[in-house]
């Protein structure tokens, strides 16, 4: 007889998932030497315990905590760079910006990027067939639980002078529902944090508006100040100068607004 | 490139010991889980035992656990193999393999040496 399983509306577990993981882990620790005091085999068996023969719509923060642990990383606290809704100029950024860092640019966030997983409650398979949609399903699924929780472990790390890379060609440039406005404004620690710098990234070749001036900005503007935490705000009119004056700063092209 | 060559292999009498090493070279070896496999004569490989990359996490089939200790040093890149208590049935070409590590009983390999025979027989 067919053992019944929960249809959910979001797509199911990434293919070769378990490999995904340790073949992520073996390749970070290859390129930070500073990690190679990671247990890849211990990672991937706290990253599936947090989630194997648990209800995929019931996972907790604290499913995550044995991971939390063995991924505990020092990233420069003065370093690091937010982004909602432009992942790959934030990652095409700090590849050329190597001191800086993007929450997947650390372990854990390097071994989930992109990635989906689930289970199942009482089983100790993984669902490559379907699980838990944010919206249509719940929001204790076993991704958007993860993500809040390095997400909210990275934004507390931050300090000095934090940024974050907005995309200026969405309708709501800065969007409070967003893991950004949702977790990781509402984390940046006061007493460490003293500036929040906003990049709006323009779209459009001839678009010369000051998105800083948008009014999700200023709503984002609003809550940070009332955080104690100052707010500055710059417009990036062109990306791919932008990123070609953060490769070669010399260029005589690069003094100019970008 | 990588290159993992295995040494130590030989003929034994039942009830002996053995040790097998595996020199690694070519990649990043604090970074690889590694394992013992073994094919016997005229059989399919059999896994035998494996060790996490930082030497934390051990593995043994049940037909060698509380027999044989697979070690790892870092520092000098080579794996280990302490073979007690020998049988007739451990007969078998020992391969040395480094992957990924493992996921329940599926082992994700990446590389393998060329062998070392190892013959029980009194």
């Known amino acids: 007889v067919p053992r019944w399983r929960q249809q959910w509306s979001g797509p199911g577990t990434t293919k070769r998932f378990p490999e995904t993981v340790l073949a992520r882990c073996v390749k970070y620790t290859e390129i930070h030497p500073e990690m190679r005091h990671v247990d890849c085999q211990s990672v991937w068996d706290a990253f599936k315990g947090a989630f194997i023969s648990k209800h995929p719509c019931n996972i907790t923060e604290e499913d995550y905590q044995p991971l939390m642990k063995l991924g505990t990383q020092t990233v420069p606290c003065n370093k690091i760079l937010l982004w909602s809704r432009i992942k790959d100029l934030a990652h095409q950024f700090t590849q050329v910006q190597r001191d800086m860092f993007t929450l997947e640019d650390t372990l854990l966030g390097y071994l989930a990027d992109d990635l989906t997983w689930c289970g199942e409650f009482n089983t100790s398979k993984i669902n490559y067939q379907s699980c838990p949609d944010w919206r249509k399903d719940c929001s204790n699924n076993p991704v958007s639980v993860f993500w809040k929780t390095v997400s909210r472990r990275f934004a507390e790390a931050a300090c000095d002078v934090v940024h974050v890379m907005l995309n200026g060609s969405r309708s709501k440039i800065f969007d409070k529902n967003s893991t950004f406005g949702s977790v990781e404004v509402h984390n940046l620690q006061p007493e460490k944090v003293q500036t929040l710098e906003a990049w709006v990234i323009h779209g459009g070749r001839e678009d010369s508006r000051d998105l800083c001036q948008d009014p999700t900005i200023k709503e984002l503007e609003s809550i940070i100040s009332k955080r104690n935490i100052q707010f500055s705000c710059k417009n990036i009119y062109r990306p791919d100068k932008f990123l070609q004056c953060v490769k070669n700063p010399e260029d005589s092209s690069c003094t100019s607004e970008i | 490139e990588v290159q993992l060559l295995e040494s130590g292999g030989g003929l034994v009498q039942p009830g002996g010991s053995l040790r097998l090493s595996c020199a690694a070279s070519?990649?990043?070896?604090?970074?690889?889980?590694m394992s013992w496999v073994r094919q016997a004569p005229g059989k399919g490989l059999e896994w035998v035992s494996g060790i996490s990359n930082t030497g934390i996490n051990t593995y043994y089939a049940d037909s060698v656990k509380g027999r044989f200790i697979i070690s790892r040093d870092n520092s000098k890149n080579t794996l280990d193999l302490q073979m007690n208590s020998l049988r007739a049935d451990d007969t078998a070409v020992y391969y040395c393999?480094?992957?990924?590590?493992?996921?329940?009983?599926?082992?994700?390999?990446?590389?393998r040496g060329q062998g070392t025979l190892v013959t029980v027989s009194s």
């Open positions: 070519g990649f990043i070896f604090s970074s690889y889980a």
């Open positions: 393999a480094s992957g990924k590590g493992w996921d329940g009983n599926t082992w994700y390999e990446d590389y």
